[in-house]
């Protein structure tokens, strides 16, 4: 398979998933650069950047799923995240425009690194599902950046509104990754415990 062989060691794979979610819950990787690039880094505007209720499963919901259901939900949710990130990327300013505006190129790079980071985590989730013998999960798409992008989830002529929606989505994403990390931290030493 193009993905390469998955690790067969449960504890090592769980440790890697914990490391990845730990790194990805951090708003400096995605939300903060997005806010700066989109010109939302003003207290009054930041106030409007709140997570939309129901956009992501709550920690309580995730905890109640059991391992297999949790991995399936995580896989599906990250699939949605990838589509949304692709859409957000389409509306980002170009590097040369950023330089002209005196904004940080590094912020753009962080935003561009988000999709590969999510893809990497999703591949490890697939590996964990395989390890738990979860046959219901399909292998993550091997498609890269060259694939046709999905339509914008919430089409609007209001550019400012779209920026705020992106901001809300990313805030929810980071909160979700924090919840995911907390759920993984409760998983035991053995792949056979707490399976529903």
């Amino acid at each position: 398979a193009a993905m390469g062989s998955c690790s067969k060691e449960y504890r090592m794979l769980l440790g890697q998933l914990q490391k990845q979610t730990d790194l990805m819950q951090d708003t400096s990787r995605l939300l903060d650069p997005y806010i700066r690039i989109q010109g939302l880094d003003i207290p009054k505007l930041r106030e409007h950047c709140r997570e939309s209720p129901g956009a992501f499963p709550s920690e309580e919901t995730l905890r109640g799923l059991g391992r297999r259901g949790f991995l399936q939900t995580l896989n599906a949710t990250l699939g949605r995240v990838l589509h949304r990130l692709a859409d957000l990327e389409q509306h980002l300013p170009k590097a040369q425009d950023l330089e002209r505006s005196g904004l940080n190129i590094e912020d753009l790079e962080k935003l561009q690194m988000a999709r590969p980071n999510v893809l990497g985590l999703r591949n490890n989730i697939y590996c964990m599902a395989q390890l738990l013998d979860n046959s219901d999960m399909t292998e993550p798409t091997k498609a890269g950046r060259g694939t046709p992008q999905p339509p914008t989830p919430t089409p609007t002529s209001d550019v400012f509104q779209r920026k705020l929606e992106g901001c809300s989505f990313l805030r929810g994403y980071h909160r979700f990754m924090h919840s995911v990390g907390r759920v993984f931290s409760k998983w035991g030493e053995s792949p056979n415990r707490s399976r529903r």
Epitope: S7, M113, P116, L119, G120
Partner: antibody
């Protein structure tokens, strides 16, 4: 067991081209990034750049941009570092290392490839 | 780029004694919203590749002996080997991952006195 196995030592002349490799095993190659790090004789570590093998998205350190090319072939779980025209100052040990999320720490390292460039 | 500066360049410590290595960054690597320091420590033994010891400034990598500990915040960090063993003879590097390009300290060589 996670392993990054690099290609063997190379002795080249200035102006020659070179491509060294780093093969990952014991983990899902497209779940992580691969970084390349240079260590010149008796010196410290210098980060050269990083690639995500899943879609070959690449970032370079400004110091190495245009000097080297980083690539990957996910079908054989291998990352590459190449030069089109070597210089004597490229003589160094080159390490590949796995990165969980970019940017981050480097959690597993290859054994290194020694590149010697001399006329 | 964030510049990492280690001190001392080398130190000699008796077996069983404490070794302390310092690392200073040219700007803070502490991210205020999660209160985490984006700093790692590596050990490189002669003829070997570097090995990750510590990340988030103080979290030990799996399998690393507990005599190794990391501390500090913002711009000033310390790696401590509480009781030096013969196998700890190596060069130690700090690295920031707050931003790209990733940067390393120049290294500190630890030897037996």
């Amino acid at each position: 067991e996670v392993q990054l196995v690099q290609s063997g030592a190379e002795v080249k002349k200035p102006g020659e081209s070179l491509k060294i490799s780093c093969k990952g095993s014991g983990y899902s190659f497209t779940s992580y990034w691969i970084s390349w790090v240079r260590q010149m004789p008796g010196k410290g570590l210098e980060w050269m750049g990083i690639i995500y093998p899943g879609d070959s998205y690449t970032r370079y350190s400004p110091s190495f941009q245009g000097q080297v090319t980083i690539s990957a072939d996910k079908s054989i779980s291998t990352a590459y570092l190449q030069w089109s025209s070597l210089k004597a100052s490229d003589t160094a040990m080159y390490y590949c290392a796995r990165v969980p999320v970019s940017p981050a720490y480097l959690d597993y390292w290859g054994q290194g490839t020694l590149v010697t460039v001399s006329s | 780029d964030i510049v990492m500066t280690q001190s001392p360049d080398s130190l000699a410590v008796s077996l069983g004694e404490r070794a302390t290595i310092n690392c200073k960054s040219s700007q803070s690597v502490l991210y205020s919203s999660n209160n985490k320091n984006y700093l790692a420590w590596y050990q490189q033994k002669p003829g070997q590749p570097p090995k990750l010891l510590i990340y988030w400034a103080s979290t030990r990598e799996s399998g690393v002996p507990d005599r190794f500990s990391g501390s500090g915040s913002g711009t000033d960090f310390t790696l401590t080997i509480s009781s030096l063993q013969a196998e700890d003879v190596a060069v130690y590097y700090c690295q920031q991952y707050y931003s790209t390009p990733l940067t390393f300290g120049q290294g500190t060589k630890v030897e037996i006195k």
